[in-house]
Interface confidence: low
Amino acid sequence: GGGGSKHKCVQNSLVNNETLESIMNTLESEEDFRKYFYYLEGSK
């Protein structure tokens, strides 16, 4: 998957006071970013 800028996606989607740096340190790929935010928002 993928497409677009994952950095832009992260900056527009930050929740729970997490920082861009901390998220990038725990997610290894663009696909991880996609799934992380999908599940985060989907389980609200």
Epitope: G1, G2, G3, G4, K8, C9, N12, S13, E31, D32, R34, K35, Y36, F37, Y38, Y39, E41, G42, K44
Partner: antibody, heavy 122, light 113 residues
Framework: QVQLVQSGGGLVQPGGSLRLSCAAS????????MSWVRQAPGKGLEWVSA????????YYADSVRGRFTISRDNSKNTLYLQMNSLRAEDTAIYYC???????????????WGRGTLVTVSS | DIQMTQSPDSLAVSLGERATINCKSS????????????LAWYQQKPGQPPKLLIY???TRESGVPDRFSGSGSGTDFTLTISSLQAEDVAVYYC?????????FGQGTKVEIK
């Protein structure tokens, strides 16, 4: 009423163009990722393209990349699929489909349009 | 791309009996970070669009009868109709949404024996 109303199908010659529309109602359209899924006559389902709620992110199947363009107008609650350089193998019923979560990323589909038939033939 | 393979292609079951459809993915659709399987099941009746039955491999969509259940993890999944009803005659599809391009199984046609 929560629904997706499709329009824009029809008969087109190979190499031609067509634009499909999908008008959404009953939910906050801009909150949801949307996809197009097609089904050739008598065949199974094939995901074609997807777009995030904001329209910032788009995704395509290899079979249509470079020929089809997905877009949305959130002010009109409408999803589009611009189809260029059409081929006989693009003949199918095209469905628009909504993702069930308020997410920027598409995944699975809880609301479907009724479908519109696109026939590519000379 | 992740290939999805369903078995059998068609299935004839007596009313009130159990129907079991299998779906196998060419690679795991289990995402370890959240322990979720990115797999959905749909029902499609003739002349109608598909209808979502199951997502996250085992979560039943609202309004779907409880005779429909999903199970499995990783690469092997099952849709079970515990007691087949006449209105369940349809084609059933699995779909992975682990990664784009999202892919569907070829479909399993369920009929009454």
């Amino acid at each position: 009423q929560v629904q997706l109303v499709q329009s824009g199908g029809g008969l087109v010659q190979p190499g031609g163009s067509l634009r499909l529309s999908c008008a959404a109602s009953g939910f906050t359209f801009s909150n949801y990722a949307m996809s197009w899924v097609r089904q050739a006559p008598g065949k199974g389902l094939e995901w074609v393209s997807a777009i995030s709620g904001s329209g910032d992110n788009t995704y395509y199947a290899d079979s249509v990349r470079g020929r089809f363009t997905i877009s949305r107008d959130n002010s009109k609650n409408t999803l589009y699929l611009q189809m260029n350089s059409l081929r006989a193998e693009d003949t199918a019923i095209y469905y628009c489909a909504k993702d069930p979560h308020s997410s920027r990323w598409p995944g699975f589909f809880d609301l479907w349009g009724r479908g519109t038939l696109v026939t590519v033939s000379s | 791309d992740i290939q999805m393979t369903q078995s059998p292609d068609s299935l004839a079951v007596s009313l009130g009996e159990r129907a079991t459809i299998n779906c196998k993915s060419s690679q795991s659709v289990l995402y370890s970070s959240n322990n979720q399987n990115y797999l959905a099941w749909y029902q499609q009746k003739p002349g109608q669009p598909p209808k979502l039955l199951i997502y996250w491999a085992s979560t039943r969509e609202s309004g779907v009868p409880d005779r429909f259940s999903g199970s499995g993890s990783g690469t092997d999944f099952t849709l079970t109709i515990s007691s087949l009803q006449a209105e369940d005659v349809a084609v059933y599809y699995c779909q992975q949404y682990y990664s784009t391009p999202y892919t569907f199984g070829q479909g399993t046609k369920v009929e009454i024996k």
